[in-house]
Amino acid sequence: QGWQAFKNDATEIIPELGEYPEPPPELENNKTMNRAENGGRPPHHPFETKDVSEYSCRELHFTRYVTDGPCRSAKPVTELVCSGQCGPARLLPNAIGRGKWWRPSGPDFRCIPDRYRAQRVQLLCPGGEAPRARKVRLVASCKCKRLTRFHNQSELKDFGTEAARPQKGRKPRPRARSAKANQAELENAY
């Protein structure tokens, strides 16, 4: 039993940490998700492929401070936000600039977090409180995942159905024997 997924101020979805080898996709308003054009079928494209490995999606860098109550990280952390659109890898690199952005094939593929990494961060607190060490899990890479019709209909099921399900719990680190940690964590930038 654990906390469910939540949506934070940066609008990314973070699954219950450590629970999913393949975390659920981001929630977003993607008009392609329930497209009714073409009789509900994805539009044909000359580069269409059945092999997910041939698709890729953009990894956008996202920098933020992490907090715990009034305590804030000494340095911002950087993670990836997975862009919602997937396209053939050979088209992605310069496609936007040339105006040849590949049209996503309906709900078939989704850009989702692939790997996570843990980063130890030092939180500095006001009022002379001792710093607090935390380990935050950050998105390290993204991948395209083929979604079945079942996925499309149920992909929201893992996210809180109860009203107001923001973020999760927290805790300060005890202060005893933490000098070493404090030093190390002040050097926690990538």
Epitope: Q1, W3, G18, R120, R134, A164, P166, Q167, K168, G169
Partner: antibody, heavy 121, light 106 residues
């Protein structure tokens, strides 16, 4: 699937020591802090301390500073709690739990099933 | 250390009733977690960060509060809710738990 499995019950004599284990599956303990909590029979919960399995650094509640030692073996993905100089006051269930932090809150989504330690002559 | 006082210690109610239990902190805390524990089981995360329900927790449960006063409310108690509920803070070291409120059904 994330699971935290603890070792079986222990019956120990006063003055002796005991070492409890907490084995994680579905995640790498190096990526998280591991906490230990004590619950005496029919009583509430007491926080013992927190361990960083990655480097062995530990923090203890003042009450347990001289009673408990937390360690870990990352190769077996296992955390340990050693209790020394046991008395009847140490008879309790000991839980290990995983600390999660999402960038805004710290919380404990996964707990072990607990290990009952009985101190009796 | 911050002491958490839970009241009442024992809450006796009937199915369908609305109940509220409180947790008062000796100093202000940023948020509160709640756990449910049934005999023979480990504590289960129940409400986190004051008002957010853990996975699988029925919507009849809710949490609220700020500063030194927090509460857990069940709108319509059901038999399966019989358990002991603990509040927990870590706004200040060491992490502390309340002594618990035992919910009994008549």
């Amino acid at each position: 699937e994330v699971q935290v499995q603890q070792s079986g019950p222990e019956l120990v004599k006063p003055g002796a020591s005991v070492k409890l284990s907490c084995t994680a599956s579905g995640f790498n303990i190096k990526d998280y802090f591991i906490h230990w909590v004590k619950q005496r029979p029919e009583q509430g919960l007491e926080w013992i301390g927190r361990l960083d399995p990655e480097d062995g650094e530990s923090d203890y509640a003042p009450k347990f500073q001289d009673k408990a030692i937390m360690t870990a073996d990352t190769s077996s993905n296992t955390a340990y709690l050693q209790l020394r100089s046991l008395t009847s006051e140490d008879t309790a269930i000991y839980y290990c739990e995983r600390e999660d932090y999402d960038g805004t809150y710290t919380f404990f989504p996964y707990w072990g099933q607990g290990t009952l330690v009985t101190v009796s002559a | 250390q911050i002491v958490l006082s839970q009241s009442p210690a024992i809450l006796s109610t009937s199915p369908g009733e609305k109940v509220t239990m409180t947790c008062r902190a000796s100093s202000s805390v940023y948020y509160m977690h709640w756990y449910q524990q049934k005999p023979g089981s480990s504590p289960k995360p129940w409400i986190y960060a004051t008002s957010n329900l853990a996975s699988g927790v029925p919507v009849r449960f809710s949490g609220s509060g700020s500063g030194t006063s927090y509460s857990l409310t069940i709108t319509r108690v059901e038999a399966e809710d019989a358990a002991t509920y603990y509040c927990q803070q870590w706004s200040s070291d060491p992490l502390t738990f309340g002594a618990g409120t035992k919910l009994e059904l008549k």
